[in-house]
Structure formats: C-alpha cells, structure tokens
Interface confidence: low
C-alpha cells in the first residue's frame, strides 16, 4: 500500500489556506476533481468539486471554498477563505474517475487553525485576511453523491461542534483522522 503522508499547515482565523494539488497532466486534465475532509472513522466527505468535465482556470466556489483547475500545469488550486478554528482537520484532493474509485492526490493536508490576535507583533500582515475578493465568474458545481470507500476502524466519539458554512450544505468539523501518518517523512 502507498504510504500516506500529510503536511501540516498552521494558519490563524480569517486567513486563507491556499493549496495546490499536482496531478498527471495527460491523464487527468479534464477529469472532475474534488476537495474532501477526512473525519474520524468515516469515509472522506466531499466539500467542493470542479465541473464535469473540469474547465480550465475556471473558478468554482462552494461557500468559502474556491477551486481552480489549471489544465496547462497539472495543478488543482484550492483556497479556503476566512478560515475558522472549526475548519481544522485533515483534507485531501481527489480525482473522480467513475466507475473506478476516486484517485487521491498526495499529500494530505493537516490544517490547524488557531485564534487570531489582531495587531499582535509578528503576525502575518501580508497573508490574506478576512476580506477576500472572490473572482467575479465563479460556478457552484454539483458533486457526485458517492465518496471513496474506506476501512473504518474503532470510530472514536465524534465532535458535535459542527459549524455551517455560508452558502453551502457542507459542515467542517474539528476532527482528526483515525489513520496515524508521519509528517514530513
């Protein structure tokens, strides 16, 4: 089995997570791609996806999540704007290839969002803060109903602190994945 690795990304409330996921250009350029959260003891849940077929450089917005697929470069760009502490968790990019299982793009992203302290010396002044300009031409895409199956082992008690995301039906919960994976290995 492929060893799962994750990268930790620490941001403050109100900032923007800006992730890029690489994929094999020739194989997946026009395939539908998705951004998923992996909750303890559950199958990955799709939060947002590109259109099908995926359009080049065409922003898709679902709530606070914006996806842009750069076909020419084999990159899916994912942004989560105006981050909240409850957004902390484990995320991944996948490529939908029905009827086959979704293809996971490495690495998974461990997002840790902490309370921001406005005006604190040393705070990241240059990073994107609460005010974020969404591209004017965005599309809200419908994602396939299925999620990638996963072996579920001894699911721990789930957090009940779900937070609704504006403009969408998704929830982001402060959870960690049951699979323990090395960071930077």
């Amino acid at each position: 089995a492929t060893k799962l690795t994750e990268e930790k990304y620490e941001l403050k409330e109100g900032q923007t997570l800006d992730v890029k996921c690489d994929y094999t250009l020739e194989k997946f350029a026009s395939s539908q791609k998705a951004w998923q959260i992996i909750r303890d003891g559950e199958m990955p849940k799709t939060l947002a996806c590109t259109e099908r077929p995926s359009k080049n450089s065409h922003p898709v917005q679902v709530g606070r999540i914006i996806l842009e697929d750069y076909h020419d470069h084999g990159l899916l760009r994912v942004r989560m704007v105006n981050l909240q502490v409850e957004d902390s968790g484990l995320y991944q990019c996948v490529i939908y290839q029905p009827p086959k299982e979704p293809h996971m793009l490495f690495d998974r992203i461990r997002l840790v969002v902490t309370k921001g302290f406005s005006g604190t010396p040393g705070s990241n002044e240059n990073s994107t803060q609460n005010v974020y300009k969404i591209p004017p031409t965005t599309t809200k895409a419908l994602c396939p109903l299925y999620t990638s199956p996963r072996t579920v082992t001894q699911a721990p008690p789930k957090s009940t602190a779900d937070v609704s995301t504006p403009d969408s039906e998704i929830n982001l919960t402060n959870v960690t994945d049951i699979i323990r994976v090395p960071v930077f290995n």
Partner: antibody, heavy 127, light 107 residues
Framework: QVQLVQSGAEVKKPGSSVKVSCKAS????????FSWVRQAPGQGLEWMGG????????NYAQKFQGRVTITADESTSTAYMELSSLISEDTAVYYC????????????????????WGQGTTVTVSS | DIQMTQSPTSLSASVGDRVTITCRAS??????LAWYQQKPEKAPKSLIY???SLQSGVPSRFSGSGSGTDFTLTISSLQPEDFATYYC?????????FGQGTKLEIK
C-alpha cells in the same frame, strides 16, 4: 533540476532604478516559486519578496514595499526584480532563488525551501 | 514579521568535531524551516528543508531537527569543507525571514 543565471553587475546612481533578471533553464518554469534575497557587504541574507509565476501575485517584505517590483515572464522563463529610488544602502549582492514544487502535493509552495540559487548580481549604488 | 534568532553567532571547532547550531522563531512555524550554507563570495547552498529533510546531494553528516519554535542543525563530524556561514530561514509566512547567521571557523 533547474539552473538560474542572473544578469551582470550594475553600477547605479542614487535615486535611479535597477532591474535584475534571472533566467531559468533545465526545468519547467511554472513548477517553481522564485524569491529574491539580497546580501549587503559583510551582512546576512535578507528576503525581499517572491513570486509564483503560475499564480502571478508577488509577495514583498514590508521593508521594500512600494520600492520593489517582482515579475515573471513565462514565455522566456525569466524572473525579474526591479528596485527603485536606490540609495547607497542598497549596495549589495542580489540573488534569485527557486523552490521546486512539483510532485509534493504541498500546501506550501516553498516546501523544499530555496533549493536552487543564482550566482548573484552585484549592484553598486554610488554617486 | 517572524524573527529568527540563531546561536551562537560564531563558533570555533576542529575537524572531526560534532557541532550544533540552534535557531529560534519568535512564533510557531510548524516545520517550515530551511538551513543554508554560504562560503565567501559564493551563493548560499540549501542543506535542509522542512526542518529535517536533507536536500539531494548533501552529505549525511548534516541533519536538522525541531518543530514549532526551536530548531537545530547538527554536523556530526566536521570536514574541512564545512567551515562556512550557516543561515536558517522560516517559510511559514511572509516575509520569509532569515536568521542572522552563524560563522563556523577552524579552531
């Protein structure tokens, strides 16, 4: 792996501008993030700013904001750094450096740090 | 801005010695730290990325460790070519700041 070749040494008058180029070869230009770092004589390294050509928007250190412009030209695989309103304290060696971000699936475009450096361009500001 | 503080600022050692240089960040930077080696009149060379990963082609006597705010660069057995200045750099958030450098000299 990419190689970075910078433009030659420059002598400039105070108040003028300098534009240093950094040509990348041996790699796919849009798979790299580029930074500009300077080093005054006998001093340490100072990060001025950076750009990820595929996304276009540069980031600058506050100290240089309004005086530095970092651009990238995909058609020629070249990154540029222009510094205006030069003063004698801008006399330094200016380095471009790149970070390869292909294949890591990374949430940080500089995942590998500044793994390749140009040879440096000496800029002397003198009246 | 995140301040990076290296210690010591200079260090005298002999060939074969084990040497440790430390770098402290003014706030947490996860593992987004790199180490560079610079020799006089030369461009810096990358040694370590992501706090502990060795760049391709760098000898295994170099190693890095740490996360959050405290990091170390260790040279297990100094070689003549290792006498140089070493810099740490955080790339957790803009601007990507460097430490002030540690000059490693022959005793």
């Amino acid at each position: 792996q990419v190689q970075l070749v910078q433009s030659g040494a420059e002598v400039k008058k105070p108040g003028s501008s300098v534009k240093v180029s950094c040509k990348a070869s041996g790699g796919t230009f849009n798979r790299y993030a580029f930074s500009w770092v300077r080093q005054a004589p006998g001093q340490g390294l100072e990060w001025m700013g950076g750009i990820i050509p595929i996304f276009g928007t540069p980031n600058y250190a506050q100290k240089f904001q309004g005086r530095v412009t970092i651009t990238a030209d995909e058609s020629t695989s070249t990154a540029y750094m222009e510094l205006s309103s030069l003063i004698s304290e801008d006399t330094a060696v200016y380095y471009c450096a790149s970070s390869h971000f292909y294949g890591s699936g990374s949430s940080n475009y500089y995942y590998y740090g500044l793994d390749v450096w140009g040879q440096g361009t000496t800029v002397t500001v003198s009246s | 801005d995140i301040q990076m503080t290296q210690s010591p600022t200079s260090l005298s050692a002999s060939v074969g010695d084990r040497v440790t240089i430390t770098c402290r960040a003014s706030q947490g930077i996860s593992s987004w730290l790199a180490w560079y080696q610079q020799k006089p009149e030369k461009a810096p060379k990358s040694l370590i990325y992501a706090a502990s990963s060795l760049q391709s082609g760098v000898p295994s006597r170099f190693s890095g460790s740490g996360s959050g705010t405290d990091f170390t660069l260790t040279i297990s057995s100094l070689q003549p070519e290792d006498f140089a200045t070493y810099y740490c750099q955080q790339y957790n958030s803009y601007p990507y700041t460097f430490g002030q450098g540690t000059k490693l000299e022959i005793k």
